[in-house]
């Protein structure tokens, strides 16, 4: 028997692709273990092999068709379980009763890319990858920028409360390299959270132009 | 500019079929969800179901599943609603709105249906 | 199914004065929770989504809480344009629900 407290967190990508991590204190070691998806009223059902991330916690994506197909709706409700071999049989570890449209993290924003840049001003666009077009223009967006000489962590935060994929920087130094990230999160759902952060984008603003001040 | 035209008022008898088109414009038809919704004077709004245009999958409302059927015609951007087997407390405006499964945010301008013998 | 009750069924408000809209769930909705406004002979109009957040169009006189299952629509000064009937509606739960709707006339 496993002792210990048991945390089964799963997300929706608004697609195709539940992500789930399950997490164990006194966990088995040498155990296999995996997630299997019951749709209350779909022909199909989906198994994933979880995978270690870390001592005590396992991870693993349910791929539930092609990348941009509508999979799931939002009236589904799935049943998700971690079952863990014991012998020859399996024993359900932990379950939940899953609301895809209530427990939402998007893909990381792609085709991140300069689209004009200045010496203290940078146009920047971006792409949503995978998003649901139940979604309409409800989405919102968060993007920082990378000072010399800062962490991400200490980057403020810009908020864009729209469908709104791209972002004018102003008050930059010129001459000076920067990084820029972005992530999205739709406004549905009680437990959506934020995208992870997209890939960073580096640019360089252009130098000032000698006896002048731009 | 988002429009949604319905067709015109129907007179109908008991026991017969309506079928109302909404035709949209001003928008991507083939990546929308078509809704319709019933308003019957002293019964208020009642959602019917929904269609999504992306893939033909459908949603009905339980109280109206057995009759209703909505379809999608992505070649002229139009959607239906068919109700079948009428009766007289089905004389209603019948509204084809646009939105995400949760809201509805565009409509149309609505069509009333009379069941009368 | 969920049921959605709207109180008062009708109010009467002066123009410029403040009108409070009351909608509750008959269960947790979350924020789950749209407004819409009908104007005679009219379609309906959505003016909030998810209990608070204004759709894009709509005047900043009209605001949304939420306290649990009870949710409010506040129009801070009223226009004459503002008299109509608004619906709140759950979608929480499918069928997705609507309230009998708040009549809100000229005093």
């Known amino acids: 028997a496993v002792n210990g407290t048991s945390q089964f967190t799963c997300f929706y990508n608004s697609r195709a692709n539940i992500s789930c991590v399950w997490s164990q204190d006194g966990a088995l070691q040498d155990t296999s273990c995996q997630v299997h998806a019951w749709p209350d009223r779909r022909r199909w059902n989906q198994t994933c092999e979880l995978l270690p991330v870390s001592q005590a916690s396992w991870a693993c994506n349910l791929i539930l068709g092609a990348p941009d197909s509508q999979k799931l709706t939002t009236v589904d409700i799935v049943t998700l379980r971690v079952l863990c071999r014991e012998g020859v049989r399996w024993r359900v570890m932990a379950i939940q009763d899953f609301k895809p449209f209530e427990n939402l993290r998007l893909m990381a924003p792609i085709s991140l890319q300069v689209v004009h840049v200045e010496t203290h001003r940078c146009n920047i666009s971006w792409e949503i990858s995978q998003a649901s077009h139940y979604f309409e223009r409800h989405l919102e967006f968060e993007a920082r920028t990378l000072s010399p000489g800062h962490t991400w962590e200490e980057a403020p935060l810009l908020t864009l409360k729209q469908k709104q994929e791209w972002i004018c920087l102003e008050t930059l130094t010129p001459d000076t390299q920067y990084e820029f990230q972005v992530r999205v999160k739709p406004l549905q759902g009680e437990f959506t959270t934020w995208s992870p952060w997209s890939q960073p984008l580096a640019f360089r603003t252009k130098p000032a132009a000698l006896g002048k001040d731009t | 500019e988002v429009q949604l035209v319905q067709s015109g008022a129907e007179v109908k008898k008991p026991g017969a079929t309506v079928k109302i088109s909404c035709k949209v414009s001003g928008f991507n038809f083939k990546e929308s969800l078509m809704h319709w919704v019933q308003q019957a004077p002293g019964k208020g709004l009642e959602w019917m179901g929904w269609?999504?245009?992306?893939?033909?999958?459908?949603e009905y409302a339980p109280g109206f599943q057995d009759r209703v059927t909505i379809t999608a015609d992505t070649s002229t951007d139009t959607a239906y609603m068919e109700l079948s087997s009428l009766r007289s407390e089905d004389t209603a405006v019948y509204y084809c709105?646009?939105?995400?499964?949760?809201?509805?945010?565009?409509w149309g301008q609505g069509t009333t249906v009379t069941v009368s013998s | 199914e969920i049921v959605m009750t709207q109180s008062p069924a009708t109010l009467s408000v002066s123009p410029g004065e403040r009108a409070t809209l009351s909608c509750r769930a008959s269960?947790?909705?979350?924020?789950?929770l749209h407004w819409y406004q009908q104007k005679p002979g009219q379609a309906p109009r959505l003016l909030i989504i998810?209990?608070?957040q204004s759709i894009s169009g709509i005047p900043a006189r009209f605001s949304g809480s939420r306290s649990g299952t009870e949710f409010t629509l506040t129009i801070s000064s009223l226009q004459s344009e503002d008299f109509a009937v608004y619906y709140c509606q759950q979608s929480n739960n499918w069928p997705w629900t609507f309230g009998q709707g708040t009549k809100l006339e000229i005093k």
């Open positions: 998810y209990g608070l």
């Open positions: 269960q947790i909705i979350s924020n789950n």
């Open positions: 709105a646009r939105g995400g499964p949760w809201f509805l945010s565009y």
């Open positions: 269609i999504d245009s992306e893939n033909g999958e459908t």
